[in-house]
Amino acid sequence: NECPKLQPPVYGKIEPSQAVYSFKDQVLVSCDTGYKVLKDNGVMDTFQIECLKDGAWSNKIPTCKIVDCGAPAGLKHGLVTFSTRNNLTTYKSEIRYSCQQPYYKMLHNTTGVYTCSAHGTWTNEVLKRSLPTCLPVCGQPSRALPNLVKRIIGGRNAELGLFPWQALIVVEDTSRVPNDKWFGSGALLSESWILTAAHVLRSQRRDNTVIPVSKEHVTVYLGLHDVRDKSGAVNSSAARVILHPDFNIQNYNHDIALVQLQKPVPLGAHVMPICLPRPEPEGPAPHMLGLVAGWGISNPNVTVDEIILSGTRTLSDVLQYVKLPVVSHAECKASYESRSGNYSVTENMFCAGYYEGGKDTCLGDSGGAFVIFDEMSQHWVAQGLVSWGGPEECGSKQVYGVYTKVSNYVDWLWEEMNSPRAVRDLQVER
């Protein structure tokens, strides 16, 4: 009642290995690492067979089949390439995930290499079975920002793609009678979030109450260069409008806000986010040079009061920009305290501009980012937001532009962008 001698399967083994197998003896067939037992189209780790009374085995010896991890999952804002010939997806094959450069980069700077494991899953040394995350690259425009000193007041045009984070925010408040329409700027922080000044998104009321405009009345344009031609721009409606809870209309303290877009915008050469600074109370140091862009008043012959009185919000057709030095807090405070009117430059603000005037931001530039190049990270960082200016005309002598100090609000911004109230859980790199 002996059963015939067994031959182990290719890439497999039989246990126990005996010279003779008698009635009721059992053997366990298993495969080498990276292979699985294949029996009747079923895949299993081991297979047991028994020597029967009539000297036959209860089953034929199964085969060992190489583990196949299958087609790798697609990566949002990324792609997968095969390192192994013939695009193999079997055990020990390698694939590499990469992000759509230069607009996205891999979180945690992982290699992106995944190997087909013995368990049939694509595995990375660091992330294990989790897929990598492609995050937007911030503060690195596809065109290098030039060193020329240009100005918004009487300035020349910015070129398309120089300020890919620049957003035009148009508010058409149809709840007002008659309807009220104005605009400002903002800066893209991620595919779904715009940073701007609170006063841009405050309902233009006849009293000083701070009430945000309804989200239905906000339209955001990205990748825009010339306001007369919006065909190439991405326009998006708002899912949420968030003003800083402590925004004070009397002194413009905490003049910062967020808009969550209805749907994420595709990034590209003309639409890229700006980086946020590290949370530090100092803000940018005096004399540091920053750039700010906007579609605000660029005609030095038109006075702000004329524009306010006429009711028109005159703007530049083509995006303008200016390079301005940061002014010391003490100098700025002193310049405003010497003026009539209740001007307070708080610790949540900083100033920029030239003592002699001539270069400045102006009405309509509100909410735009004052960006400074960070030598350490080699990124442009939004250190300020265009907030307010003195009673004189834009670009007047010893009247500095005042900017919201973004570094004081970084924690608040992350909190809001990652709060459960946010319409979707969108990841943004800190």
Epitope: R176, Y252, G341, P391
Partner: antibody
Framework: QVQLKQSGPELVKPGASVKLSCKAS????????INWVKQRPGQGLEWIGW????????KYNEEFTDKATLTVDVSSSTAFMELHSLTSEDSAVYFC???????WGQGTLVTVSS | DIVMTQSPSSLAVSAGEKVTMSCKSS????????????LSWYQQKPGQSPKLLIY???TRESGVPDRFTGSGSGTDFTLTISSVQAEDLAVYYC????????FGGGTKLEIK
């Protein structure tokens, strides 16, 4: 067109309460606050408070914080003002206004008398 | 609290005359940042609800005749009616909206 229609005149006894209504139509009710103003016979205007229908935020003139309670019913686009512990001093015409005072109700006369 | 004082308390003019009335506030109503004075003017005709004439000290409400003009800044404001008509018989109130709301005592305009 925009209209604010206020409830009819009220004759109430001292110590009692009364609830006045102001029904809005013809504009975005939730996006515009409703103000309430008091005018005693032959006297000037006194601001009582306002309510913002979108989130129910209220602001009151300090002199009316214990006297008036403002509420809204968004489904019917109606604002309400309840006046408590009435005395003869509360006998007045009460107006509601909206869209930042561009539109006013016709007023409700409240008479407090025993 | 901001106190609003109107003067005169009443005045009588003939039709066609120019009239000015004053409103003073106990503190400045100008918000430098917005370059706006938070002051409004209202007209209340006998037996009627008040009507908004001017807001932000000088912006005329739509539909208001251009004979009504608001001016002033800070704490001193004026409402001018360039050529008074018979239908302008009313009490005129100013109101601050710089910090909540406060009405002035009113100026009663009578036609001679």
């Amino acid at each position: 067109q925009v209209q604010l229609k206020q409830s009819g005149p009220e004759l109430v006894k001292p110590g009692a309460s009364v609830k006045l209504s102001c029904k809005a139509s013809g504009y975005t009710f939730t996006s515009n606050d409703i103000n309430w103003v008091k005018q005693r016979p032959g006297q000037g205007l006194e601001w009582i408070g306002w309510i913002y229908p979108r989130d129910g935020t209220t602001k009151y003139n300090e002199e009316f914080t214990d006297k008036a309670t403002l509420t809204v019913d968004v489904s019917s686009s109606t604002a309400f003002m309840e006046l408590h512990s009435l005395t003869s001093e509360d006998s007045a015409v009460y107006f509601c206004s909206s869209v930042e005072d561009s539109y006013w109700g016709q007023g409700t006369l409240v008479t407090v008398s025993s | 609290d901001i106190v609003m004082t109107q003067s005169p308390s009443s005045l009588a003019v003939s039709a066609g005359e120019k009239v000015t009335m004053s409103c003073k506030s106990s503190q400045s109503l100008l918000i430098s940042r917005t370059r706006k004075n938070y002051l409004s003017w209202y007209q209340q005709k006998p037996g009627q609800s008040p009507k908004l004439l001017i807001y932000w000290a000088s912006t005329r409400e739509s539909g208001v005749p251009d004979r009504f003009t608001g001016s002033g800044s800070g704490t001193d404001f004026t409402l001018t009616i360039s050529s008074v008509q018979a239908e302008d018989l009313a009490v005129y109130y100013c109101k601050q909206s710089y910090n909540l709301y406060t009405f002035g005592g009113g100026t009663k305009l009578e036609i001679k």
